[in-house]
């Protein structure tokens, strides 16, 4: 069966029907359907005016305008808001009421596209394998990235979050139109990786998506990840404005000027120093989502009531931090180079800058506890990787899972750890699953391009597609049309259960309490440490292109940083070393092919010898269940807040000191809606409150934006990376 021309709100579209084997199965593929009008710089997306006749949807459209890897030119287009659809078809009748999976790509909110990098004539985010193996509809789409997607003045002049609104437009388009393609508009699952995983998380939290999303999967990125929310957007807006010759004294004039500036100039005005970096895709990203008081009405930690009815899977790769650690400490991947205590202490101190000497020392002690028994270089290098994995990915994900569970009504919660080791042959044997290593398996690359893979890779891919698509169908990864290797139990705050995904899976793959001691350290011990003043916490600026990479101070010189026990806002971008550019989660679409190359030969990579898939071993000691991360108005994942902490915290009700623990009962308390202009964020509901979602505050056309301290001329943002 095949669809032929499909009528959408924009008009008729016609794709391509691709036959699969001899049994008569096929897949209808639509590439390049517009879901919004061509964009206007730094404006919200608008509905597409439509077309007459039948649109031939047979080729991917250009990605949204972004800098090339070399950053000396741009590629992509302003006219980029298009989506792609894969619809599996059986022999006889056209498919109906299929679950729908919408992919959101990563790329540090700076790069990427809905189709991904091309490798062996196969695009990374080609939805065919997921669609046909899981019998689901797959949708991918483009959204604006970099300054064009996320530049913000922190007020109504340029509220920001244009890229998030693009994502929402795509989701809403799918909801309205997917029935015509054979999809069930009431069964939409979002999934994404890295910045895409964080985007998935943010979309579930935004009141704009009420009723649109049934389920969600965040891979290596959640809304609480420390690199997701920009607390100092005005600083970055001014940097770009200066570069393109716009006035910076008055935000309204600056905004008007930026809107009429050549979008290519805006894109290239934001450069990242790449000198000496082995992986140029790792850079500091200033243009990421903001709390705008409307699309993201409050700190994400306070919005989990909005996701109470959305089934959720979240997880990380066991060495998500490896790529970042290897930038910060190149010795990690070099057998002949050593990681020293001094190196690691310096790295730790940069992450913990707002907690001063005590923060650095305590964190260092916790992480180096195993070094006395095992002083080997392998152990030390693993520690560095574990540290960055914890801070950038694992702990924020654990908090997000706990928040989801604590607020969930009927919704289910599942956690995973992906541990199938990296295929990158140049890595040491001990390296596990690096950042973005999971994508190729979710998208079925071992089947689509089999020459680059081994049977064990196909085993992993088959299992992931089965779990992911079963979840999309039923909300339970074990239940659906696809057989799974072992039962995946839901995550609860009591068991902290997670599934470890490896090449050999059985009942022992279901584990509990991942890195409990470290989770407890970050959420309780570290959080309770006193915050130091700015003078004590001034970082040493990096050398390099200071024009391209501003070195902001670490906080407001007028006020001491607010400790992260209240609504201190989103966590800062943590420092990751002294490279001058903090690592931002790369994506599969980072210019690197999904299967790591072994040179330019195009030959498949040499599989790593040995089974390096073991997850990091948690320290011995108290192996009890991890503490439930705070569900109160803490606003602080386990990374230090910057001095620019925003308004003073709203103390949690009850105990004014320790962060609140999610209650087990039904509190019935509705969330307090932020008013956009209030100095304090709302106190979130504490449990299964049955409360309505936090709505946007004010008119969506001119969203109120919560005041940020960086609106004071004297203050510049606190980014501890530098």
């Amino acid at each position: 069966a095949k669809l032929g021309a499909v009528y959408t709100e924009g008009g008729f579209v016609e794709g391509v029907n691709k036959k699969l084997g001899l049994l008569g199965d096929s897949v209808d593929i639509f590439k390049g359907i517009p879901f919004a009008a061509p964009t206007k710089a730094l404006e919200n997306p608008q509905p597409h005016p439509g077309w007459q006749g039948t649109l031939k949807a047979k080729n991917f459209k250009k990605r949204c305008l972004q800098a090339t890897i070399t950053q000396d030119s741009t590629y992509g287009d302003e006219d980029c808001l298009y989506l792609n659809i894969w619809v599996p078809q059986g022999r006889k009748q056209v498919s109906r009421d299929l679950p729908v999976m919408i992919w959101i790509y990563g790329g540090a909110f700076l790069m990427g596209s809905g189709h991904g990098a091309n490798f062996l004539n196969n695009y990374l985010y080609d939805g065919e394998e997921i669609a046909t193996r899981g019998n689901v509809i797959v949708v991918t789409f483009n959204y604006r990235v970099g300054p064009l997607g996320f530049l913000s003045t922190g007020d109504a002049n340029l509220p920001g979050n244009y890229g998030l609104r693009d994502q929402h437009m795509a989701i809403a388009w799918v909801k309205r139109n997917i029935a015509a393609f054979g999809g069930d508009p009431n069964n939409i699952t979002l999934f994404g990786e890295s910045a895409g995983g964080a985007s998935v998380s943010l979309q579930t939290l935004s009141p704009y998506n009420k009723g649109l999303i049934r389920r969600a999967i965040s891979q290596s990125g959640v809304a609480l990840s420390p690199w997701v929310i920009q607390k100092n957007p005005l600083f970055w807006a001014k940097k770009v404005a200066e570069k393109v010759g716009c006035p910076v004294g008055d935000a309204a004039r600056m905004a008007q000027c930026l809107k009429v500036t050549d979008p290519r100039a805006l894109t290239l005005a934001y450069k990242v120093p790449l000198a000496g970096l082995e992986y140029p895709m790792l850079h500091y990203v200033g243009f990421v989502p903001v709390i705008d008081g409307d699309f993201i009405p409050a700190d994400p930690i306070n919005l989990y009531a909005n996701a109470a009815d959305i089934d959720y899977i979240a997880g990380t790769n066991n060495m998500d931090g490896h790529i970042f650690a290897s930038i910060d400490m190149p010795a990690i991947n070099k057998g002949n180079k050593k990681v020293t205590e001094e190196d690691f202490y310096k790295l730790v101190s940069e992450f913990t800058i707002t907690k001063g000497l005590r923060g650095a020392k305590t964190t260092f002690d916790v992480y180096t506890e195993s070094w006395a028994q095992d002083p080997s270089q392998e152990n030390k290098k693993k520690t560095v990787v574990d540290f960055e994995t914890d801070v950038l990915f694992l702990v924020p994900t654990e908090i997000a899972l706990a928040q989801h569970r604590a607020n969930a009504k009927s919704a289910k919660t599942y956690a995973y750890l992906f541990s199938h080791p990296s295929r990158m042959p140049v890595y040491p044997k001990w390296v596990g699953a690096d950042h973005a290593d999971d994508i190729q398996y979710v998208f079925g690359k071992p089947f689509a391009t089999p020459t680059g893979y081994r049977p064990q890779d196909r085993t992993v891919s088959k299992a992931m597609i089965a779990y992911w698509t079963n979840f999309a169908k039923t909300g339970d990864p074990n239940m659906g049309d696809s057989a799974v290797p072992t039962h995946w139990e839901p995550y609860t705050t009591e068991n902290s259960g997670y599934l470890e995904i490896t090449k050999k899976m059985g009942s022992s793959s279901m584990k509990r309490s991942l890195r409990t001691n470290f989770l407890r350290y970050w959420t309780l011990t570290y959080l309770a440490l006193p915050t130091v003043t700015d003078q004590e916490a001034t970082p040493v600026p990096p050398t390099g292109d200071s024009e391209a990479t501003p070195v902001p101070p670490t906080g407001d010189s007028e006020t001491a940083p607010v400790p992260p026990t209240g609504d201190s806002g989103a966590p800062p971008v943590p420092p990751t070393g002294d490279s001058g550019a903090p690592p931002v989660p790369p994506t599969g679409d980072s210019g690197a092919p999904p299967v790591p190359p072994t040179g330019d030969s195009g030959a498949p990579p040499v599989p790593p010898t040995g089974d390096s898939g073991a997850p990091p071993v948690p320290p011995t000691g108290d192996s009890g269940a991890p503490p439930v991360p705070p569900t109160g108005d803490s606003g602080a994942p386990p990374v230090p807040p910057t001095g620019d902490a925003g308004p003073p915290p709203v103390p949690p009700t009850g105990d004014s000191g320790a962060p609140p623990v999610p209650p087990t009962g039904d509190s019935g308390a509705p969330p307090v809606t932020p008013t956009g202009d209030s100095e304090t964020a709302p106190v979130p509901p504490t449990g299964d409150s049955g409360a309505p979602p936090v709505p946007p505050t004010g008119d969506s056309e001119a969203a109120p934006v919560p005041p940020t301290d960086d609106s004071k001329e004297a203050q510049m943002p606190a980014v501890i990376r530098f």
Partner: antibody, heavy 119, light 105 residues
Framework: QVQLVQSGAEVKKPGASVKVSCKAS????????MHWVRQAPGQGLEWIGV????????SYAQKFQGRVTMTRDTSTSTVYMELSSLRSEDTAVYYC????????????WGQGTLVTVSS | DIQMTQSPSSLSASVGDRVTITCRAS?????LNWYQQKPGKAPKLLIY???SLASGVPSRFSGSGSGTDFTLTISSLQPEDFATYYC????????FGQGTKLEIK
């Protein structure tokens, strides 16, 4: 100017079929989608479906799927809407309506054709 | 399908009055249009894309709204404005509101 002229009123028995025509003039026939909308006596408007006169692609509302067929004759710039297995509740005025521009609203309407289904 | 709910379903007003009719969609929509229909006649397009005035429509008609909530306003009623008004959303399965009958008081 744009004109849409529909065929005359019809009286049909339950179970029969009816075919209503809509002749277009004043514009390039193949360039704009044509929709069919009906209105039962004293009731509101109900979308039946759409045809692209350029390639003949059609889309029908779920409610009418399997009972309605839309066709076109480019040589006479006419679109047709055939509804089968008629029942009394199909008694209505049937309108053809052309898109205004793009995927825009229904900007131009025929005068309507009353179809009465009665035994 | 997306449901469109108009309110009020009927309305009595006098010449010169300012009148507002609202239309609410069951989910966020991209395209909303307003039509006027007089007895025995075909509907006539008034407003498209929520706020754009169709060709030849007097400027006393205006539309606003986005997402799920939309309004049609007639700033000063004229005798020829007494009719039934319909909102219409354009998705892959278009639907109309049930209509608002505007009568002379």
């Amino acid at each position: 100017q744009v004109q849409l002229v529909q065929s005359g009123a019809e009286v049909k028995k339950p179970g029969a079929s009816v075919k209503v025509s809509c002749k277009a003039s004043g514009y390039t026939f193949t360039s704009y989608n044509m929709h069919w909308v009906r209105q039962a006596p004293g009731q509101g408007l109900e979308w039946i479906g759409v045809i692209n006169p350029g390639d003949g692609a059609t889309s029908y509302a779920q409610k009418f799927q399997g009972r309605v067929t839309m066709t076109r004759d480019t040589s006479t710039s006419t679109v047709y809407m055939e509804l089968s297995s008629l029942r009394s509740e199909d008694t209505a005025v049937y309108y053809c309506a052309r898109d205004y521009y793009g995927s825009s609203p229904l900007g131009y309407w025929g005068q309507g054709t009353l179809v009465t289904v009665s035994s | 399908d997306i449901q469109m709910t108009q309110s009020p379903s009927s309305l009595s007003a006098s010449v010169g009055d300012r009148v507002t009719i609202t239309c609410r969609a069951s989910q966020s929509i991209s395209y909303l249009n307003w039509y006027q229909q007089k007895p025995g006649k075909a509907p006539k397009l008034l407003i498209y894309a929520a706020s754009s005035l169709a060709s030849g429509v007097p400027s006393r008609f205006s539309g606003s709204g986005s997402g799920t909530d939309f309004t049609l306003t007639i700033s000063s009623l004229q005798p020829e404005d007494f009719a039934t008004y319909y909102c219409h959303q354009r998705s892959s399965s278009p639907t109309f509101g049930q209509g608002t009958k505007l009568e002379i008081k």
